[in-house]
């Protein structure tokens, strides 16, 4: 276990007995929870890799950046950060890698300044639909969240509830229309097979959307039309076979967009012709010369940009692994 930081450092660690003696009272201005490091100057508290099983009750009121990574929190109950006086300054909260499997309704209530939340690398088998909105009203008070990081929150298959993981996550994103101000959403590495069609339309402020390293096969029913502020769309490392005309037109219509499409198993047959034509003309795709055919075998490793219509014929035979993707 690490020892308290020296007094020369801007971080301080209180002795455990001090923390326990006052944990039921409002925190003292310079108090630091046991097993944490605090810097009032940086408005930062770090309780990292300490196997904490609950959120410390005696967090200092000045905290603006709170790191609770690498712990064993398991459950985040309603009002997990509700304090008296409230943590009115808390703007960035990182809970990644803390073995959370349940986040309950209202877990982040009473955090009026919370702009960045990172729940990555937690096996979230049970994410309440009202985790971010705090209430089950059809229209909730707007959340202050601007950045929501949910990379690799998919639980192991044997721990999943008997429902769609995609559906569970989307329900939490859309509940009460609380996240209308969200600008960055990261959903990488979650084994998503599809993107529910209504999700993007209800997040109109998005600037950055990361869906990389999922298992998305198609974007046919996904609409990007309303995302007029979208600046980056990460779709690398999925199972995309082709992008169809509707999707291509919508992406081209977004004024600030950069799209990342590397490492998808593009199928270079007759259905690819529109995408190839678009790639040759568009400036929105980053690193477009790196996009290569994966199937059929005779087209493998061919660069999409260099194909012409004569190359793109339709042969119904696909390898078994692709038919089942």
């Amino acid at each position: 276990s690490s020892s308290p930081t020296s007094s020369a450092s801007s971080f301080s660690s209180s002795a455990p007995f001090l923390a326990s003696a006052v944990s039921a009272q409002p925190p003292l201005p310079d108090q630091c929870p046991a097993l944490c490091e605090c810097s009032e100057a940086a408005r930062t508290v770090k309780c990292v890799n300490r196997n904490l099983t609950e959120v410390p009750t005696d967090l200092p009121a000045y905290v603006r950046n709170l790191f609770l990574t690498g712990n064993q929190l398991a459950v985040l109950p309603a009002g997990a950060f509700a304090r008296r006086p409230p943590l009115a300054e808390l703007a960035a909260l990182n809970l990644s890698g803390s073995r959370l499997d349940e986040v309950r309704a209202g877990a982040f209530e009473h955090l009026p300044s919370l702009r960045q939340l990172d729940l990555s690398h937690n096996p979230l088998a049970d994410l309440s639909p009202f985790a971010f909105s705090g209430s089950n009203a059809s229209v909730s008070a707007p959340s202050p969240l601007v950045e929501l990081i949910l990379n690799h929150i998919v639980p192991p298959e044997d721990e999943r509830q008997n429902r769609s993981f995609e559906g569970m996550v989307v329900a939490a994103l859309l509940a009460g229309r609380a996240l209308q101000g969200l600008r960055r959403l990261e959903l990488a590495s979650n084994h998503f097979l599809y993107l529910p069609r209504d999700v993007l339309a209800q997040l109109p402020s998005l600037r950055h959307l990361d869906l990389s390293n999922n298992s998305l096969v198609s974007l046919t029913y996904v609409s990007f039309r309303n995302l007029t502020h979208l600046e980056s769309l990460h779709l690398e490392d999925n199972a995309l076979k082709v992008l169809h005309n509707g999707t291509l037109a919508e992406l081209q219509g977004l004024p600030h967009i950069r799209v990342f499409l590397d490492n998808n198993p593009w199928v270079c047959d007759c259905h690819m012709a529109d995408m190839v034509t678009w790639l040759k003309e568009t400036e929105v795709v980053q690193g477009k010369d790196r996009l290569t055919c994966a199937y059929p075998e005779k087209m493998r490793n061919r660069v999409l940009l260099e194909l012409n219509s004569a190359d793109l014929d339709c042969d119904p035979i696909l390898p078994p692994s692709l038919q089942t993707s």
């Epitope: 493998r300 490793n301 061919r302 940009l305």
Partner: antibody, heavy 116, light 107 residues
Framework: QVQLQQSGAELMKPGASLKLSCKAT????????IEWVKQRPGHGLEWIGE????????NYNERFKGKAIFTADTSSNTAYMQLSSLTTEDSAIYYC?????????WGQGTTITVSS | SIVMTQTPKFLPVSAGDRVTMTCKAS??????VAWYQQKPGQSPKVLIY???NRYTGVPDRFTGSGSGTDFTFTISSVQVEDLAVYFC?????????FGAGTKLELK
Amino acid sequence: QVQLQQSGAELMKPGASLKLSCKATGYTFTGSWIEWVKQRPGHGLEWIGEILPGRSSTNYNERFKGKAIFTADTSSNTAYMQLSSLTTEDSAIYYCARGRRDFDYWGQGTTITVSS
Amino acid sequence: SIVMTQTPKFLPVSAGDRVTMTCKASQSVGNNVAWYQQKPGQSPKVLIYDASNRYTGVPDRFTGSGSGTDFTFTISSVQVEDLAVYFCQQYYSSPPTFGAGTKLELK
């Protein structure tokens, strides 16, 4: 059928530079990336980098930046790799291959020996 | 860089044996793995792509499987002409990296 024909073996002095060639036939040269791979006994296969001949786009393994430079001549369907400031560590077989995902066709290799 | 740890280094075999070698990636690479055969004095030849797909013309005694970090390459009944070094390669992220190889040799 696809073929990659590489230049012959070379014996070089330390500090010298040389240019290896890889002539492609049997496919559209500009339409696929050419990869370069180094093989030394006891060191296995090591990716040096790649070039897309039609666009002269290149990507290098960090370890070989400053050591290797790729070029391509689309009129002769030939890719080149220049190696500079040779040392004994550069003694190896160098392969060109067609790829980007797996490397589906390989040249026969060029053996380079660096010795004073 | 992603490290591909290939085991075993040497595999003593007799004709007709079923043999298996494995490759473990230092992080998930999806199914972006190929297997190559290299005979003495020759360049490598790709046998398997996307972890489990055999290239046309590759005998069906060669099979690959796995995803994520653990991959397996099997020869169901070794022939004398299969004596060679076999390499795995990941192409999930740059730089592409290879395993150190498994050498098949006669018992």
